[in-house]
């Protein structure tokens, strides 16, 4: 293969791969017809002048996961055909000016996971055809004005995982073709008005895991093509009323892990394409009517781990397409009978870890497609007659860790549970809390005759048209099916990250097997 170095493997497709700790310099001679060269996991510490001079047909060059800390300015001379250059996962602290000069065809430049302390306008001034620039995982504290001014064709820019404390409002002004901008995991505390105004084609903006406290009202007003906006794990305490007003294409918005106390009216909208809204781990205390009413296509709404104690009966107006609603780990004590009335397509609802003492009999009356209901760890003593009767698709119902009162009023529920045991899961079954003589016994197998008879006036049945006779269950059996819904947690799926750690701690994401978030 035109002379393949012994430390490398060369394929017929003009691909050369050189790996191994014994390699301390760029191997020679490299095949003159090589189009792809990978130098990985070596002990190379520096690149001297023109080590690739004789392979001018090279299109892709990956020099990754080495000990590389120094590069001579002329290292990439004569690589005019090079389209892809990766220097990721090395130990570079400084880039020499002019390093990329002559790389007129370069489209992708990966400098991620090094130790770069600064970049200058002169570094990329020759890279006019660059489409992708990866700078994440360095030690950049500041991006000077003009740094990207010549990169007018850039479509993807990753500055995540640096030490940026502020961004100049002019630094992105010439990047009219940019589609993806990632600034996650920095130390940004605020973003000046106008910073994103030039990014008219932006589709993804990742600002999660910073220290942003305040969003300027018009920060995203020019980003009409934005589809994914990640604002999670910041210090945002309030959202200006018009901040999301001009985002008609948005389909994913993450705001979890902030300090939001309330959701201003009309804050979400109009966003006709929004499919997912992640709001867990905030300080929201109540949900007024119509707060989500502009989100007609929303399918996933995650409100878990807040402090919600009141939900207005019209809070979920407009959410006719919602599939997943997570309200677990809040401070809910009461739910108005109409609160879920609009959620005709709801499949999974999580209400565990609240303080619910009772449920309205018609709480699920319009929600015929429910497949999973999480009600564990509340203050429920009984459930209204017939509450699950119409839920033919229900296959997962969690009722454990409630103080069930096993007097004669529990019979209809007990009988229904007997017939529908598979839906309760095998991990934990509901047990009686009172009377004392049956405490701790399974609600399903309890002999109610030994329990104290009911001394309180029973509630009016929710479905009075369904007669109940003590010797027959009020809750008819329905076919038990297993839940197939599996939502993934909101991991921002970046193809340019070498590793993505997915936490499968369901308590973090908030649902059970059928639901994440």
């Amino acid at each position: 293969y035109h002379g393949c170095p012994s430390e490398c493997t060369c394929s017929r497709a003009s691909q050369v791969e050189c790996t191994g700790a014994r390699i301390v310099a760029v191997p020679t001679p490299l095949p003159w017809n090589a189009m792809s060269l990978q130098i990985l996991n070596t002990h190379i510490t520096e690149l001297n002048e023109s080590p690739f001079l004789n392979i001018s047909a090279l299109i892709a060059l990956r020099i990754e996961k080495n000990e590389l800390s120094r590069i001579t300015p002329g290292a990439f001379r004569n690589l005019g055909s090079l389209r892809y250059l990766s220097l990721a996962n090395n130990k570079l602290q400084v880039l020499p000016i002019g390093l990329f000069q002559g790389l007129d065809s370069l489209e992708s430049l990966l400098l991620s996971s090094n130790q770069l302390l600064q970049i200058q306008p002169a570094h990329f001034s020759q890279c006019s055809n660059l489409k992708e620039l990866q700078l994440h995982g360095n030690h950049l504290e500041y991006i000077p004005d003009g740094a990207f001014d010549h990169l007018v064709g850039l479509t993807k820019l990753n500055l995540g995982k640096n030490s940026l404390t502020h961004i100049s409002p002019r630094v992105f002004q010439h990047l009219g073709n940019l589609q993806v901008l990632r600034l996650y995991e920095n130390r940004l505390t605020d973003i000046p008005m106008g910073t994103f105004d030039g990014l008219v084609n932006l589709q993804e903006l990742a600002l999660q895991q910073n220290q942003i406290g305040l969003l300027s009202p018009g920060l995203f007003h020019n980003n009409h093509n934005l589809q994914r906006l990640y604002l999670s794990n910041n210090h945002i305490s309030q959202l200006p009323p018009s901040v999301f007003m001009q985002l008609p294409q948005l389909n994913r918005l993450t705001l979890f892990g902030n300090s939001l106390k309330e959701l201003s009216p009309g804050i979400f909208g109009p966003m006709p394409n929004l499919r997912e809204l992640w709001l867990y781990d905030n300080h929201i205390s109540s949900l007024p009517d119509n707060v989500f009413s502009n989100l007609r296509q929303l399918q996933v709404l995650i409100l878990s781990r807040n402090q919600i104690s009141f939900i207005s009966p019209g809070a979920f107006n407009g959410l006719t397409e919602l599939r997943e609603l997570s309200l677990h780990t809040n401070a809910l004590q009461d739910l108005d009978g109409n609160v879920f009335r609009m959620l005709a397509n709801l499949q999974n609802i999580s209400l565990q870890n609240n303080r619910l003492r009772q449920l309205p009999g018609n709480i699920f009356a319009n929600v015929n497609g429910l497949m999973a209901i999480q009600l564990q760890n509340n203050q429920l003593e009984n459930l209204p007659l017939g509450i699950f009767d119409h839920l033919g698709k229900l296959c997962e119902l969690r009722l454990y860790d409630n103080p069930w009162r096993c007097d004669s009023d529990i019979l209809p529920l007990r009988n229904w549970l007997l017939l529908n045991q598979p839906r309760l899961g095998t991990d934990t079954v509901p047990v009686c809390f009172s009377p004392a003589n049956v405490r701790g016994q399974s609600l399903i197998i309890i002999n109610v005759n030994v329990a104290v008879p009911s001394v309180h006036v029973p509630e009016v049945p929710s479905y009075p048209e369904t007669p109940w006779y003590p010797d027959t269950p009020s809750y008819p059996d329905t076919t038990s099916v297993s839940s197939t819904t599996e939502l993934t947690s909101p991991v921002e799926d970046y193809t340019d990250l070498t590793t993505i750690q997915v936490t499968d701690d369901r308590s973090v994401w908030g649902m059970t097997q059928a639901q994440s978030g």
Partner: antibody, heavy 118, light 107 residues
Framework: QVQLVQSGAEVKKPGASVKVSCKAS????????INWVRQAPGQGLEWMGW????????KYNEKFKGRVTMTVDTSTSTVYMELSSLRSEDTAVYYC???????????WGQGTLVTVSS | DIQMTQSPSSLSASVGDRVTITCKAS??????VAWYQQKPGKAPKLLIY???YRSSGVPSRFSGSGSGTDFTLTISSLQPEDFATYYC?????????FGGGTKVEIK
């Protein structure tokens, strides 16, 4: 159909208390919030607070906190609003009202006139 | 508390007239505004909710509009039974508050 029937008119002296009742019918009483709204003669409407009959939980307008108490008797499907330390400016018609599909008042009681006079 | 400023406080009109009543909230309440009609000695009656939705049984001559802070109730062609007092109410945040009322009288 939903009906809210209130107790009759009351005349009270300043400093006294009054307890107005509101009996609900035509729906499952424990499942929906009931509010109290008052209207002084020739004046506008003023929201006093709500009670959730299923649990007895309440939320009061700060203006009335410490003076108003809302309670429930599920056995008779009745909610009560007690206002203490009455003053002449508490003279008003007191309405109970139930929300519909939102936090607006779809169903109203007929009102109870409370007159505070020495 | 959110103030709801209603205007005019009273107006005189004739049967068949188009009547417009406005309500201004002291802060953004989204579309969480309702309009009520009240006749002497009677409880208020819900006309409009969510700023623009007619309650069931309410004639189509009644319409509502607005969002944020500015809201309007319009009676397109005043009928004899429409002479009453009209109130707006915000239900976006506690305490829920009402406007001062607009009395519509016969000219």
């Amino acid at each position: 159909q939903v009906q809210l029937v209130q107790s009759g008119a009351e005349v009270k002296k300043p400093g006294a208390s009054v307890k107005v009742s509101c009996k609900a019918s035509g729906y499952t009483f424990t499942d929906y919030y009931i509010n109290w709204v008052r209207q002084a003669p020739g004046q506008g409407l003023e929201w006093m607070g709500w009670i959730y009959p299923g649990s007895g939980n309440t939320k009061y307008n700060e203006k009335f906190k410490g003076r108003v108490t809302m309670t429930v008797d599920t056995s008779t499907s009745t909610v009560y609003m007690e206002l203490s330390s009455l003053r002449s400016e508490d003279t008003a018609v007191y309405y109970c009202a139930r929300w519909g599909y939102g936090a607006y008042f779809t169903y109203w009681g007929q009102g109870t006139l409370v007159t505070v006079s020495s | 508390d959110i103030q709801m400023t209603q205007s005019p406080s009273s107006l005189s009109a004739s049967v068949g007239d188009r009547v417009t009543i406005t309500c201004k909230a002291s802060q953004n309440v989204g579309i969480n505004v309702a309009w009520y009609q009240q006749k002497p000695g009677k409880a208020p009656k819900l006309l409009i909710y969510s700023a623009s939705y007619r309650s069931s049984g309410v004639p189509s001559r009644f319409s509502g509009s607005g969002s944020g802070t500015d809201f309007t109730l319009t009676i397109s062609s005043l009928q004899p039974e429409d002479f009453a007092t009209y109130y707006c109410q915000q239900y976006n945040s506690f305490p829920y508050t009402f406007g001062g009322g607009t009395k519509v009288e016969i000219k």
